[in-house]
Interface confidence: low
Amino acid sequence: GSLHSPGLSECFQVNGADYRGHQNRTGPRGAGRPCLFWDQTQQHSYSSASDPHGRWGLGAHNFCRNPDGDVQPWCYVAETEEGIYWRYCDIPSCHMPGYLGCFVDSGAPPALSGPSGTSTKLTVQVCLRFCRMKGYQLAGVEAGYACFCGSESDLARGRLAPATDCDQICFGHPGQLCGGDGRLGVYEVSVGSCQGNWTAPQGVIYSPDFPDEYGPDRNCSWALGPPGAALELTFRLFELADPRDRLELRDAASGSLLRAFDGARPPPSGPLRLGTAALLLTFRSDARGHAQGFALTYRGLQDAAEDPEAPEGSAQTPAAPLDGANVSCSPRPGAPPAA
C-alpha cells in the first residue's frame, strides 16, 4: 500500500471504482462467497446490460466491481433481493498507493501519537491536509469523523487489523471510508499534496486534494528526479473537468514543454516514456475546478532511448509489476516533504 510501491496496487481510486482485476469471490484467495456473473443476473439494478460501454467494467464475468460509486468493489451473491444478496469484496491488492492499511487503535497510547481532531465533515483529504499542515508524515482517519497525525515510527509498534475493519463511511463523503470503531485507516500525507520533490526510483503522484475532487484555482507543481536516464509515466486515472484544467510536463533542466493534457485531451492509456531524467509537472485548475483529477505512476529508466518503433508518448507494453518484496513502513529516502 505504500506510495512507493505502485506496482502492487490494482486500484488508484479510494473506493476501488477503477478495479479491473479478476477476484470473483467476496474474500481473497478463495475465501468468502462466489460472485454472480454480471451478465446472468436478471433481478438486480446493475448488470452488463446496464453497462453497455464497459465504463464500470461489468461484462460476461463475475469479478468484483464498483459500478455505483459505493465505498469499495462488491458483487451480487444471490439472485433475489432478499436476505444477503450482495457483499463487499475484500481485495488485498485494491488499496490505493499511499494507504498504509487499517490499524488497531486502542487509544492508550493512540496508534498515531501526534495531534488529533474531529469533524462532522471529515474526508480523507481533510485529515491529510490537517496533518500535512502540522508537519507530520502520516494521517489516520477513525470512526468516520476523527483524524490523527503521526510519524512512521508510530507504525513500527502499530498492529494491523483486517482491512474490512476499516468500514466506516466518512461523515463528509459517502464514497470514502474513514477507519472504523477503534480502527485507523492510515495514509501518507503526500497523497493529494500540491507540491513535492520526488526522488524515489518509482512512485505515485495524485492530483491536489485527492482522493477528494481537486478544488478551484489550484496551481501545483511536482519535481521528479528519480535515478536513471529517462522517465516512464503511466496515468492510472485522468478525469479533468474541462479544457481549462491542465497538466503540463516540462523538462526540469530546460523548462521546455514536453506534453500537455487537459479535460479535452487526455493522456495515452499506456506508459508514456520521456527522454529526460528530471521532470516538472504543473497542474492548474480554473475558477470552477472540481473533478476527480489524476493519479499517475512514474519510474526511472536506465535507458534514455525512446522506442524507435513507436512515436513518443504512445502506448507501449506495460512493464511487469514492480517488485514489492522490500516495501516497509520504515522512513524512506526520497519521500516528498509535507506540502
Epitope: R33, T80, E82, G83, I84, Q168, P174
Partner: antibody, heavy 117, light 111 residues
C-alpha cells in the same frame, strides 16, 4: 457513529394522514436496505416492509399492502412511512431498522403513533 | 409465509443459571451454507437490539454468555449464565425470503 433518528411521537384522529421519518447518519445510507417494523401495545414485532435504496422500490408484507407507503429521500438520507387515512388499529410503536448480512443491526428509537377520536 | 414459533412464551431462571429459548421455522431458513436466522433482545421502552446473526454469530459488543445454534428449521438461543440485565423479551427472526417474520417473543425473568 451509525444512527437512525426517527421523528417524534404523533397523536392523530382517525382518517387523518401522517408521515413519519427515519434519518440515517454515520454510514452510506444507500448501501443498506431500510425496513419498518410495527409493535402494537404489549405485542411482538411485525415486519411491515422495506425499501430498496438504489431503486427506491418498496416491498410490503401482505398485511400492510395498500395500508402504508414506504418512501425515500436519498438527498437527505431519510426514509419515510406514511398513512393516507389512519385507523385506531394503527396505534403502535413504529421502528425503522437498517438491514445487512447481520440482520437488523441498527434500529431507530421508535415513533409512537396514537390514533384516537 | 414462513411462520416462526418461539417456545416457551416466558421463562423464569435463577441468576447464574442457563436459559434456553427455541425457535422453529415452518420451513428451512438455511441455504448455501447460511442460516438466515437472527436473535434480538428488547428491553422495556427500548428498540430491539441484535444479539446473534446468521444463527450463530455473536454481534459485536454482545457478551459471550449469549450463543446461538441450529440450522434448517430448529434454532436455539442460549444464555449460559443469566444476569439481571438480561431480563427482556427475546425474538427470533428469519430473512430467508419475503416476508421476513419474527417469532412471537419469549419473556425472560429472574426466578
Amino acid at each position: 457513529e451509525v444512527q437512525l433518528v426517527q421523528s417524534g411521537a404523533e397523536v392523530k384522529k382517525p382518517g387523518e394522514s401522517l408521515k413519519i421519518s427515519c434519518k440515517g447518519s454515520g454510514y452510506s445510507f444507500t448501501s443498506y436496505p431500510m425496513h419498518w417494523v410495527r409493535q402494537m401495545p404489549g405485542k411482538g414485532l411485525e415486519w411491515m416492509g422495506w425499501i430498496k435504496m438504489y431503486s427506491g422500490v418498496p416491498t410490503y408484507a401482505d398485511d400492510f399492502k395498500g395500508q402504508v407507503t414506504i418512501s425515500l429521500d436519498k438527498s437527505i438520507s431519510t426514509a419515510y412511512l406514511q398513512w393516507s387515512s389512519l385507523k385506531a388499529s394503527d396505534t403502535a410503536m413504529y421502528y425503522c431498522a437498517r438491514n445487512w448480512d447481520k440482520g437488523f443491526d441498527y434500529w431507530g428509537q421508535g415513533t409512537t403513533v396514537t390514533v384516537s377520536s | 409465509d414462513i411462520v416462526m414459533t418461539q417456545s416457551p412464551d416466558s421463562l423464569a431462571v435463577s441468576l447464574g443459571e442457563r436459559a434456553t429459548i427455541n425457535c422453529r421455522a415452518s420451513k428451512s431458513v438455511s441455504t448455501s451454507g447460511y442460516s438466515y436466522m437472527h436473535w434480538y433482545q428488547q428491553k422495556p421502552g427500548q428498540p430491539p437490539k441484535l444479539l446473534i446473526y446468521l444463527a450463530s454469530n455473536l454481534e459485536s459488543g454482545v457478551p459471550d454468555r449469549f450463543s446461538g445454534s441450529g440450522s434448517g428449521t430448529d434454532f436455539t438461543l442460549t444464555i449460559s449464565s443469566l444476569q439481571a440485565e438480561d431480563v427482556a423479551v427475546y425474538y427470533c427472526q428469519h430473512i430467508r425470503e419475503l416476508p421476513y417474520t419474527f417469532g412471537g417473543g419469549t419473556k425472560v425473568e429472574i426466578k
